[in-house]
Each structure stands twice: as C-alpha cells, then as structure tokens.
C-alpha cells in the first residue's frame, strides 16, 4: 500500500451524560486510515493536568491501513476548558500535522433557521422612503447568539439593541431589524443577516429583485441560414443583444461550445439606436460539419450593470424532416401597371422551419432586397409555409421571361435545393415545364369554403369572383383554389387578394 496520511476526529461525550459531580472526564482523538505506522499523538491541556494513553494501532481490514485512538483524562475545573489533540505522521512528510481543538463534551443543539423578511412596497408598487429588513432567527436551542448585518459582505454599523429574543418551549427565537434608505436599497447592494451560534455561522441574504432578464435587456441567438450552410458552405451564427443602456462598462459576448472545443474568431458590431439604447451583435463562423453533427453553441453576455450573465444556446433543430414543395405564380396584368408584374412563390409543408428563399433571373441570383419573404408559419398539418413576393419590370421579362424561385432546405434532395420557374407571359415565352399558370386566374389560399373570397388587406373583390376548384388541366396542387371570373362579355376581372 502507498503512503497515506490519517484523518483525525475528536471523540467527546454528550454533556448531559456527564454527572455534575464528576471529578474527572475522558476525551479522545481518533487517527484513522494512515499507512505506514506510526503516528504520534500529543495533547495540549493548557493549565490543567491530565493523563494520556495511546492505544495500540489496529489494522483496518479492507484497506490494510491503520487506526489508533489516544485518550486524555482530565480532572478538576475542566468544564469550560478547550483541549488540542495534535497528530503527526512523519511517513507522509516530516512536517505533517493535524490539530483538533475541542471541549470535553458536546452539547446537542438545534441550529437556528435564519430568514430575512422585507417590508412591502406601497399600494402603487413603489418603494417607500425607507425599507425595513427583519431578520428572524428561529428554532434554536437557547444559547448565546450574535447578529451582524452586512452590506455587500462588509459589516454595517447598526444599533442591535432592538434585537429581541423569545422562548417557546425548548427552542428560542430572536429578531433584528435593519432600516435602509430607499437610495441604499435601490443601489443593488446585497444585505446579509449573519448569526454566530455554537461556533457556526448562519446567514440569509437579500437584495432588490432584478427582472428575470435584467433591466429589460434581451439576447437572441440565431441559427445559420440554410443558404450559408449548404450553398456558401460558410455558416455563421449571430448573438444579438438589444435594449442595453449605453454606459462606461463594456458588454462582453463570449462564445463557447458544449463539447469544450475551441471556437473561431468572432466579429462584433455595436449600434446606437434612435431610442438611445445600444444594440450589440457578435457573429461567429461555425463549421458546417460541426453544425450538421449537432454541436451546441453558447453565447454568454456579461456587463458590470447586469446582476447576472445572460446565456443563450443554439443547435441544429431536432425532430422530423420534410422537404419543401415549391409553387411559383405570376399575377395577371393590372390596369395602370403594364410595366410591372408581381411574382409569388408558395413554399410549403417543410420541416424544420429553417429555410432560405432566393429568386434568380438569367441564372443570376437577385439581391435579397428585391424580394420580400414572410417568416415561416405553421400549416394546419405539422409543416411550415412561407410566401415570397418579387416585383419584376418589363425590361427584365422582355430580356428573358423566366424567373426562378429557389428554396434551400436541409431536407431537400439531392442538393438541399428545390426550385420552380415562372414566366410573366407563359404563352409568349413558352412557359416552363416546371410550373404553369392558368390563364386569367388568380391564386387563392387553400382551406377556404366555396363562396366569396376574403380580401387581403381590406380590399373587396369583384362580387362575381369566387373561389372555385382548380381545373384538372391546371397542374397545381389539389388543395389550392383559383378565383374564377364568371361574367360573360365583360373584360376579365382579376383579383389578387387571398381567399
């Protein structure tokens, strides 16, 4: 067995078991778990005479280590005396010593419960000019206790003469009051009621409660866009902190990975908002493979004025996967807008909700600012859908009348993209095999009852336009309806709202 130092324990009797007329009393010291022999036990008895006896070491069966007990018998005025047992084990090291100081007997005691109670706010929920803190020290075996109030860990100069003690049965209770100015209380300091009793310290602490997200500050952590992840293959995640009050302290945004592996170098941007608050963003490049394999990334926000750090974490969305269905449509010509058309793209039934939408013309991706795409919304089933809207000019469709709506999504195969082409004038341009449009018909949202369409944005459709079933010769999904103009002999009426 290797060298092992002893653990040392004092051995005392219960005070109530020692007769009041006892002329002598014995206490002991146990040294156990050491190897090899020997240990040296000595006693410091102060001014009292005592006799000591160290018992022969015994072997602990399981470990092969040793244990020994040294006994001290004292007589006379021992009651309040403290004794020190000193154990040395030179095999551990020449200066290995453990001291235990204790009294002849141990008193059974019930430790106190310490609780701080706080005065209420006024009726309007505001703090009054002074705040009272009441420290309740309850349920302890009667004995000497000392109460101290601390402010941020420093002893306060408080008049403790107001502390009052009561006894109920065999247990005692004490209370102490501290009065604070509103200014002190609102300064966000921590106040502690510290009680010393039977050689132990008991505390409770309190402070003005912070909001769950301190001072209205919010932090958000985004996932990488499917476009960055699968097409550009340079995914990033962004930690966004908003509603910070500009101050001298620095906002720290720290990145970490759940795996403990190192993170890449992040870029940081600070922006002063019109309302005077500060917005801080930190963008972290992540490994494509790390993200796909499910690594969790954490952003930790600290600031001297925040009572606690804000933590946000992000990882790949779990759950079922479903590839998006993509449908592209062109709106018919609108009176007075002959040189502009709106193209619409419905992307639906995909899971999870992370999706990137792009529009292409002439095999070139159009800038994101050109199109407007809704946030993913849940379908009636378990998937999600988005609409994307693109305005095109006559010059563009006359140059080449084919526009492509492309969805980038992790469940799309083979290359995480699904796309559909759409033409402004399918008859002239020959259209696209991927998506055709019924002439003079306008897409209606699915799920509506037969009858008048529901106007989008409050516009009222022509009274003779209604939601009818899609024609068999129009290759749209069966759950989509089309608006049909039923009047004969009139100029076709088209309505672009959703049913």
């Amino acid at each position: 067995a290797s060298t092992q130092s002893p653990s040392v324990f004092p051995l005392t009797r219960c005070c109530k078991n020692i007769p009041s007329n006892a002329t002598s009393v014995t206490l002991g010291c146990l040294a156990t778990g050491y190897f090899p022999e020997p240990v040296m036990v000595t006693w410091d008895t102060g001014s009292l005479n005592g006799t000591t006896m160290t018992l022969p070491a015994t072997t602990l069966t399981l470990s092969g280590h040793y244990a020994t007990i040294s006994l001290l018998t004292v007589s006379g005025a021992w009651a309040k005396q403290m004794f020190t047992c000193r154990v040395a084990h030179t095999p551990s090291s020449t200066d290995w010593v453990d001291n235990k100081t204790f009294s002849v007997c141990s008193r059974d005691f019930t430790p106190p419960t310490v609780k701080i109670l706080q005065s209420s706010c006024d009726g309007g929920g505001h703090f009054p000019p002074t705040i009272q803190l009441l420290c309740l020290v309850s349920g302890y075996t009667p004995g000497t206790i000392n109460i101290t109030w601390l402010e941020d860990g420093q002893v306060m100069d408080v008049d403790l003469s107001t502390a009052s003690t009561t006894q109920e049965g065999e247990l005692a209770s004490t209370q102490s009051e501290l009065t604070l100015s509103q200014k002190h209380w609102l300064s966000d300091r921590t106040y502690t009621c510290q009680v010393t009793y039977q050689g132990h310290t008991f505390e409770d602490s309190t402070k003005k409660c912070a909001d769950s997200n301190p001072r209205g500050v919010s932090a958000y952590l985004s996932r990488p866009s499917p476009f960055d992840l699968f097409i550009r293959k340079s995914p990033t995640i962004t930690c966004l902190v908003v509603d910070l009050a500009p101050s001298k302290g620095t906002v720290n945004l720290t990145w970490s990975r759940a795996s403990g592996k190192p993170v890449n170098h992040s870029t940081r941007k600070e922006e002063k908002q019109r309302n005077g608050t500060l917005t801080v963003t930190s963008t972290l490049p992540v490994g494509t493979r790390d993200w796909i394999e499910g690594e969790t990334y954490q952003c930790r926000v600290t600031h001297p004025h925040l009572p606690r750090a804000l933590m946000r974490s992000t990882t790949k969305t779990s759950g079922p996967r479903a590839a998006p269905e993509v449908y592209a449509f062109a709106t018919p010509e609108w009176p007075g807008s002959r040189d502009k058309r709106t193209l619409a793209c419905l992307i639906q039934n995909f899971m999870p909700e992370d999706i990137s939408v792009q529009w292409l013309h002439n095999e070139v991706q159009l800038p994101d600012a050109r199109h407007s795409t809704t946030q993913p919304r849940k379908t009636k089933g378990s998937g999600f859908f988005v609409f994307s809207r693109l305005e095109v000019t006559r010059a563009e469709w006359e140059q080449k009348d084919e526009f492509i709506c492309r969805a980038v999504h992790e469940a799309a195969s083979p290359s995480q993209t699904v796309q559909r082409a759409v033409s402004v004038n399918p008859g002239l341009a020959g259209g696209s095999a991927q998506s055709q449009r019924a002439p003079d018909r306008v897409l209606c949202h699915s799920g509506q009852q037969q009858g008048l369409p529901r106007a989008a944005g409050g516009s009222v459709p022509h009274p003779r336009c209604h939601c009818g079933a899609g024609r068999a010769d129009w290759p749209g999904p069966p759950e989509l309806d089309v608006c049909v103009e039923e009047a004969e002999g009139e100029a076709p009426w088209t309505w672009t709202g959703l049913c």
Partner: nanobody, 126 residues
Framework: DVQLQESGGGLVQAGGSLRLSCAVS??????MGWFRQPPGKEREFVAA????????YYADSVKGRFTISSDNAKSTVYLQMNSLKPEDAAVYFC?????????????????????WGQGTQVTVTS
C-alpha cells in the same frame, strides 16, 4: 442545461501552488463549495463560500493555505491552493447550491449541494 466545469488541476511539487476554477453555466447559485477525494478515500470537504455575502469556511486541514473566492460577473469560483502537501493530492470537485441561506453548519456537508462538477485531478509530488 446546468454545467459546473472545473479546471486548473495538474502536477505540482510539494510547497508549490495551483489555482482551480469552477465555471458555472445554466443557473445562478447562492453558494459554492470545493470537495476532494484522495485516492482510496471518501470525498471530503475543503472550502465553501456564500456568493451573496462572501463569507467563507474551510476545513481545518487547509486553513491558512487555501483561499476560496468568486467572480460573480464571470460566474466562476476559484480555489487558490498554496503550500501544497502530498496529502492534498486528490480529485477536486466543485459543488453548487441555490438555497438563499448559508451556514458553516451545513456548508461542509455533501448533501447541501444539488449540483456537482466532474472533477479535476491534483497531483502533488514530494
């Protein structure tokens, strides 16, 4: 997800120093403790701190040599270990508690703490 992550352990000569860190994430705590488990022995108390008042408590065997401290802004607790002895060699664990009240009476008890780290090895050679 609550995590307590110890670091700073290693090999040191007797008489040398080490500083252990315990980084906390996922929750805010009111008190922290350090415990150690020497080879072939039970886990034992080393030091504890109230994160509210800054009050500290130490095992007799480390008093005067070890110092526990905290940096609340970084959610980290430290154990500065000086004058290390061979008997200080152990796996050191940090532990955390959310109870608002704190006392030396309970701080040394393992049952006081609901959250524990995985431990960091400290080896002291003579």
């Amino acid at each position: 997800d609550v995590q307590l992550q110890e670091s700073g352990g290693g090999l040191v000569q007797a008489g040398g120093s080490l500083r252990l860190s315990c980084a906390v994430s996922g929750l805010s705590f009111s008190s922290m403790g350090w415990f150690r488990q020497p080879p072939g022995k039970e886990r034992e108390f080393v030091a504890a701190i109230s994160l509210y008042s800054g009050s500290t408590y130490y095992a007799d065997s480390v008093k005067g040599r070890f110092t526990i401290s905290s940096d609340n802004a970084k959610s980290t607790v430290y154990l500065q270990m000086n004058s290390l002895k061979p008997e200080d060699a152990a796996v050191y664990f940090c532990a955390a508690d959310r109870q608002r009240t704190w006392s030396t009476f309970y701080a040394s008890r393992q049952a006081t703490y609901n959250y524990w780290g995985q431990g960091t090895q400290v080896t002291v050679t003579s």
